[in-house]
Structures are given as structure tokens and as C-alpha cells.
Amino acid sequence: ELENLTVTEVGWDGLRLNWTAADQAYEHFIIQVQEANKVEAARNLTVPGSLRAVDIPGLKAATPYTVSIYGVIQGYRTPVLSAEASTGETPNLGEVVVAEVGWDALKLNWTAPEGAYEYFFIQVQEADTVEAAQNLTVPGGLRSTDLPGLKAATHYTITIRGVTQDFSTTPLSVEVLTEEVPDMGNLTVTEVSWDALRLNWTTPDGTYDQFTIQVQEADQVEEAHNLTVPGSLRSMEIPGLRAGTPYTVTLHGEVRGHSTRPLAVEVVTEDLPQLGDLAVSEVGWDGLRLNWTAADNAYEHFVIQVQEVNKVEAAQNLTLPGSLRAVDIPGLEAATPYRVSIYGVIRGYRTPVLSAEASTAKEPEIGNLNVSDITPESFNLSWMATDGIFETFTIEIIDSNRLLETVEYNISGAERTAHISGLPPSTDFIVYLSGLAPSIRTKTISATATTEALPLLENLTISDINPYGFTVSWMASENAFDSFLVTVVDSGKLLDPQEFTLSGTQRKLELRGLITGIGYEVMVSGFTQGHQTKPLRAEIVTEAEPEVDNLLVSDATPDGFRLSWTADEGVFDNFVLKIRDTKKQSEPLEITLLAPERTRDITGLREATEYEIELYGISKGRRSQTVSAIATTAMG
């Protein structure tokens, strides 16, 4: 059963249908919508059988409609249900207001029902002109927009319409007058020089596209000088003006073809700067110093002429940078009067010339630089100099190899000698001397000096080593030492040290009576006025005592036997054999043998007698240890 058809309006351009029907009964529904006065053809819609409501959009506003519906079940149509309803009235815009007015733009605000319009159509028309209107559209969601690009102080009529697909509201209008173009603020001249000035002005930020500056010489029909500068500037340097000249400067702002009322200021450039206060002073006997005053940053350069007063033909010209206010002029003659002139140049223009006269000083003299009393660390200097001129003397001491820092002394101008100390020994120096008086430095004179070597103690040598001693020798500077101390200590430090004091002229010491075959340390120190040098050291081992050994008895006979032994080669001068019967019944027999012998046949002894035999070697007069043996002669 299909029933309960209700129709309600959905806005001004649509209707909503609701109905009831048995669930899952219908394949689909057929809906017919027709204007009540049947002006236009009916609209048919087919909707699925599951629906129980549908919106019908796109209808005419404020129009009565007849709506019919039937269902289809297995090809069978149900009876038709019908109902009548009218669409609503079209919505109107609310009010339109101008929220903000500037001189070149305004802000438009309006009210409208939400979601009613696709867009708004706005028309901006200058009042009382036939000029084409400005048209713009804005989205239907907006309720405000800016209208830029307007003319200042101009009447405008602004209309707005809301627009849908097939409908436009009645327009709303508003009239408005844009404001005047803002005026410039203050124009001031903040800096004035002889050839330039600086303008400063105030304006609202971001207002002007550009400014036009006009610079005109007052009381002149000469063409004005125009400058256009960006609207962001508030200051401008105007160069290239004439000195001491009145100028009228005007400024106006420009914005989209509009010009402000001009601002004007009058100003007089300063007079051309002049040079002043030329002073000339002597700088030694061969130079002059010039000082002058001048305006800062004014001059390209200065031209100076220096001329001997009595020699007109030989002038010296110098061109100097415009930043200078002083210069030294060297290379002049001593005790000579000079005329000095100077002028400045400013963009090709010459200032008046300033002149002054001055004389160079008499040439002072220094000479005869002499070096004396040279020691390992010092020397004395003496020199000659013109009296009463010098305030100080400067002495520079430079080592010839340039390995040391230069030492500089400044001493009184009354001195003619100096003691230079604290120098390293055995070093070549160049001494430079110059004299200084007010504004004067003489030519430098020089001399050379070499500091003496420090006294030397070196080359400790040990020679002539033997079992009982050795010779100590060394080298030392002549006349450097009052005495030498030689100390001899055994390496094991078991014995007392032996000390030998020698005169400062001695260079060697022979040591005897030492122990054979042990180590010794030898130290040699020099003394000067009781001050001891660090010792030279050497270590040495005395030779071992030569040995006689292995005394053997063989080949016994009734009156003797053969003796043989061993001994160090090349050490002994000779050997001594002592033979005596053990009962001491006969005189002892003593035999001296030459060094190369190592055997001896002994005869003339008693038969069957026991003998005690002793053997020792002799080397350089000293006896070796004795070796002994017992031998018995054979029975007869």
C-alpha cells in the first residue's frame, strides 16, 4: 500500500517528498512534478523502490507545483498519490556598507543568507562619468572584499548582486567618495657643503611610487636639474653644485599618476674651501716638513713647489693625494733657504697659492766610531760629534749573521762613549751610530766588532797508560785560568780521591803509583778568581800487572835440573831466578835472564838435595809477583 505523500519546500528552488510503503514491495517509484498552471512540461523521475523520500531541485521560485507518485510491483502500477506545494520566495541580499575608505581603495561589506548564492557580482562606477565601470565577481561564501586601484577624491557608485545558476538578486548600491592623496611631510636640508647638499623628507610609508626632486639655481632661468628617486627613499645626496650659490629645491611624491603638492626649500652652498696655515719646519739638515690645514674630503690633490730662494730655475714639484695635510721634503741642501708654495685642486679648480720660506739646518757631524776593550760579552765604543747639537745618539748593535735580535740603545747627546755589554762571546757585530736633534737625524756611521771567545777548557786526553799510571793532558785558553785542579778517583770509590793543583800555565800531569788493572775517573777543572769550571771527565783502566806463571821442574840430574815457565809476551825486560837448598846449608844462587828466555838448565848443585826455587819478572824496574817451586836433584 503506497500512502501518506507529503511535500515540503526545500529553499526557494526545490521541494522534498516523503511517503510510506510496505518494505521490499516495490521495484521502483515514478514521480511527476508539474507547474500547477501547466506552463511547462512535467518532469518525471524514477527512483529506487527502497527510497521513501526524495529532493527535487531546480524548480522556479514562488511557484505552485503538483507532485504525483506511484509504485511499480512486478510491472504492476499502484494507484497514483498526488499533492500540491509551492516553492519559496527568492532570497534577497541584506545590506551593503563601505567599511574603510582610503585615497586609492575601499573595503566593501555586505550581508546575505548563507549558501544562497554561487557568487556576487560587484560593479564599481565613477559617478558623473561615462567611463566604463570596473566589474568583479567574488565567491558566494564571502561577505567582504577590498576594492583597490581607485582614484583619489572621486565619487564612486558601487552595486552588488547575488547570483545563482539562473537567478540574480536585485542589486544593492552604495555611494562613496575616496579620500585626498596624502600630503608630503617636511623637507629639510641636513648637510650643506660647497658642492653638494643632503635632502631629508618625511612621508607615510609605502605611499609613493617615486619622488621627483628639482634643483634650480635661484634667480636663474637656466634649466632645472631633475632627479627621480624610488618611493622607498627618505634622503638624497645632491652633488655637483656650485660653491656659494643659492638653490631652490622642490620635491613632490608621485603615485599612480597622482602628484602631491610640492614641498620647497631654499639653500645656499658653502664657499669653496681654502687652504690655510701653511707651516714649514726643518727636518734635519737635508729636509723640510710642511703642514697645512684644509677642509676634509675636499681636494683631489695638492701641488707643492719647492725652490731654493736664490735659484729660480731649479724648482721641485710634487703632487700629493688630497687626504694629506703634511709632507716631508727630503733631499735638500744643508743650511739653504727655500720657498715652498702649495695649492689644492678641486674638480679641476685651483685654490689660491699659499707660500712660506724656511731654511734647512746646518749639517751636524759624527765620526771616528771606534771599538775598544773587547771582552767575551762586551766592548766599549767611542766617537766624535759636533758639540751642543745632539739630544741623543742611537746605537744599533746587529750581529753579522742576523741570528740575534737587534739591540738599540738611546743615550744622551752629551756622551761620546758607551759600554755595550750582555753580548754573546765569539760573535761578529756591526755597530751603527746616528745622532738625533730636534727634527734631525744624521747619516749613520758604522764599525765592526767581534766579542772574544769565552775561555775554553777542552780535549781531555789520557795517554801513556801502563799498569801503574798514565798521563793526563788538556787544552785551555791562554791566560784564562789561575790554576787547574786534577782529581783522580778509583771507579769503585774505595780509595780517597787524589787531588793535584797545577798552575794555570800547565797543560799536562803524569800520574804514577796507581794500582794495576783497575778503573779510574779523571776530572780536570780550571779556576778563575776562585770560580771553578765544570770539570772535563775521562775514564781509564790501568793495565794489568804482567804475570809470570807455570814454573815447572824437569829432567833432574845429580847436579841439577831443568826449569821452564810462562810469561806475558813483550812485557818483561828480564827474569830473576833464586835457588836455595831448603835446609839453607849453602849460599843462595841468583840468576838474571833476558826477557825472551822461558827455560834454563841449572847445574852445579848437590846430589839428592831439595831446593826452593823463586822466579819473578822485571818490567820497567818493577818486580812482578813471585812464583815458587820445589825441586830435588837425583841420586849419584
Partner: antibody, heavy 118, light 107 residues
Framework: EVQLLESGGGLVQPGGSLRLSCAAS????????MGWVRQAPGKGLEWVSA????????YYADSVKGRFTISRDNSKNTLYLQMNSLRAEDTAVYYC???????????WGQGTLVTVSS | SELTQDPAVSVALGQTVRITCQGD??????ASWYQQKPGQAPVLVIY???NRPSGIPDRFSGSSSGNTASLTITGAQAEDEADYYC???????????FGGGTKLTVL
């Protein structure tokens, strides 16, 4: 006990002369080298001169060379320093000192003040 | 001066202090060291390699390396506050030279 006693100091004008003496006792004077060391007011020590045991060798600092003379009389156990052409910079306490052969100055006197001023 | 010393050095009571002396002549000669208290004559405290005259406490010692000599006081006492001068030979022409002196303060 070793004693060294200086005398002869005093005030003298620049260019003037003074003779300092040092009387020694308590050691073998003739076996010791002797010397003079000075100390300007508020300054450090400065060696001036020295003489060997018998007096045959003398030594001088550059600053006094040619103006000062050291000498000794071993019979009187006395050391002398003759100072000529005195300058303001010679103003100092002058100490007499002894040293044995293998030692530096090991005993000093108490000093005598020399003032050179106009 | 041919022998160079630091003008002033300080040490806490009982601590160790080292006073140095530099000069070319110290490459060859040992330095000697003198102590001088205000208004008094100098006193020899160290000579040679490291020798002390009789009466000098063993807290004083000397050493030498290259062109530098050192005086070390181990466990400085209040009575050690004084000026200390190093001294050496400079060869035959100028046989004796002194350093400029070091003022030792014991805190």
C-alpha cells in the same frame, strides 16, 4: 776568626779621590786572593777589582778601569783601593772580600759607604 | 747584566723554591750563590758543583745545566727571606760577574 774591616769611605765631590783600606786578620793574608765588591743604594752587587796573593796580578771591571787601583801590603795584612775621578754612579757601599785558591769570595767585611755628590 | 736572575720569587713556609741564574759563562763555570739580608754583608751559601761552606744548612743545594744554574731551598724557613745573588767567572778579562739578584719572600 776571619775579620775584614773596611775604612776610608765618606762624601766626596765628583772628580775627587778616596783611598779605601781593608785590615785583615784571622787567616793567612799573604795566601789569599782579595777583592772589592760594591753595592749602590737599593741595587745589586757589582764586582769592582781583585788582586792575586803576591800582588803581581790585578783585575778591574770595565766601569772603573783606568780610574781605580787595587794594591796590597802583605806585611801589614791590608788591602787598598785607590779611587780617582769619582763619579756620581760610583756612590755605593764598598765591601772588601777574600777568596782562597779554589773558592769564590768566602768572607766579606761589613762595608764602607762612599758618596759622590756635589 | 751577563747573569740574569728573576727579580723576585716567593715561597710558602716549609715548601721548596728554586732560584735560577742564566748566562753564557755558566756553560763553562759553576755558579756561586750569596745570601744577603738587609743591612748585612753577603754570605756565601753554595759554590762549585754543589758545595756548602761550614755553617750553611743542608736545605740549600746547587745544580747546573747548560747555561742555567739553580739554587734550591728545600723546606724554606722564615730566616731564608733575603736577596740571593748568583756569581761566576767570565774569563780572564772580567773575572767576576754577579747576577742582578732575586728577592726571596717566605710567606
Amino acid at each position: 776568626e776571619v775579620q775584614l774591616l773596611e775604612s776610608g769611605g765618606g762624601l766626596v765631590q765628583p772628580g775627587g779621590s778616596l783611598r779605601l783600606s781593608c785590615a785583615a786578620s784571622g787567616f793567612t793574608f799573604s795566601g789569599s786572593r782579595m777583592g772589592w765588591v760594591r753595592q749602590a743604594p737599593g741595587k745589586g752587587l757589582e764586582w769592582v777589582s781583585a788582586i792575586n796573593e803576591e800582588g803581581g796580578q790585578t783585575y778591574y771591571a770595565d766601569s772603573v778601569k783606568g780610574r781605580f787601583t787595587i794594591s796590597r801590603d802583605n806585611s801589614k795584612n791590608t788591602l787598598y783601593l785607590q779611587m780617582n775621578s769619582l763619579r756620581a754612579e760610583d756612590t755605593a757601599v764598598y765591601y772588601c772580600a777574600k777568596h782562597p785558591p779554589h773558592r769564590p769570595f768566602d768572607y766579606w767585611g761589613q762595608g764602607t759607604l762612599v758618596t759622590v755628590s756635589s | 747584566s751577563e747573569l740574569t736572575q728573576d727579580p723576585a720569587v716567593s715561597v710558602a713556609l716549609g715548601q721548596t723554591v728554586r732560584i735560577t741564574c742564566q748566562g753564557d759563562s755558566l756553560r763553562l763555570y759553576y755558579a756561586s750563590w750569596y745570601q744577603q739580608k738587609p743591612g748585612q754583608a753577603p754570605v756565601l751559601v753554595i759554590y762549585g758543583k754543589n758545595n756548602r761552606p761550614s755553617g750553611i744548612p743542608d736545605r740549600f743545594s746547587g745544580s747546573s745545566s747548560g747555561n742555567t744554574a739553580s739554587l734550591t731551598i728545600t723546606g724554606a724557613q722564615a730566616e731564608d727571606e733575603a736577596d740571593y745573588y748568583c756569581n761566576s767567572s767570565h774569563g780572564p778579562r772580567r773575572p767576576v760577574v754577579f747576577g742582578g739578584g732575586t728577592k726571596l719572600t717566605v710567606l
